[in-house]
Amino acid sequence: KESCDVQLYIKRQSYHSIFAGDPFKLECPVKYCAHRPQVTWCKLNGTTCVKLEGRHTSWKQEKNLSFFILHFEPVLPSDNGSYRCSANFLSAIIESHSTTLYVTDVKSASERPSKDEMASRPWLLYS
């Protein structure tokens, strides 16, 4: 897609398997042409996406893409859930697909499951 619209590159039905207590960066890749849009993160609560206020966020610039990053320092069990970024562009709101964090609470796990286990069985993770 070659256009001068803002585009948010989060894959549909993507997810991340992460551990409580670890640091984690959730990235929203943003493509824009001239002026960088204002981007925010929200967390889904049912069908409503609740804007995340007062959280540590930052920008990272790469060659053809910018990344708006939500920092988890550290990840908490309550961070489990689905997140969406959105951009304000020419007074329109562009929303990304949601991405899901599956948080394993290591206190309740006898040992850390392998990445393969977590990747293939997200329903076993913290819920």
Partner: antibody, heavy 119, light 112 residues
Amino acid sequence: QVQLVQSGAEVKKPGSSVKVSCKASGVNIKDTYMYWVRQAPGQGLEWIGRIDPANGYARYAQKFQGRATITADESTSTAYMELSSLRSEDTAVYYCAVYDGYYESFDVWGQGTLVTVSS
Amino acid sequence: EIVLTQSPGTLSVSPGERATISCRSSQSLLDSDGKTYLNWLQQKPGQAPRRLIYLVSKRDTGVPDRFSGSGSGTDFTLTISRVEPEDFAVYYCWQGTLFPRTFGQGTKLEIK
């Protein structure tokens, strides 16, 4: 344009494993999902699972959970599907396919790999 | 899992006629993002399937405009306005809304 080339036909003994490869060209596989579907002789299509090559996370149909393993190597733009504990009912053509993870704007299938399980 | 039921199992038509294939889902395919992830595939003997239609009604690049998709919720239709000789094949609907992905059982379009 996006193309997928799969490995060649395999004949396997019951109880053994098979690993089928699928090499993509014309696309950065980090921007896609790659998935596997099989088709037994004269039958319909059956979804096995899919992988996000950007992070290696896979999802499987319950029927194949624990028996199928889907992996991807971003450096070679190749996905793999390994199926273990083979039985005669696993005789089928195995297809890999790739689609755009953001807009679903393309969906391309490989040519298929015939796996025959026979003693 | 979502069950997709296609009808008819076999459809006999003459070239130039209209062909209509139905796909019914056991539950709504409307996703939380407001889109409906229902696709149609065409498979010719000895060949891999090819996607014709995605998101219910969007035609893939290079697909002739005689192919059209419609429907919403649980009921979907693939229509070929005037069947050409190269259209005789098996057609599958499949859903990408929920895991696991599932396919209809297929409809064979044959020459009358």
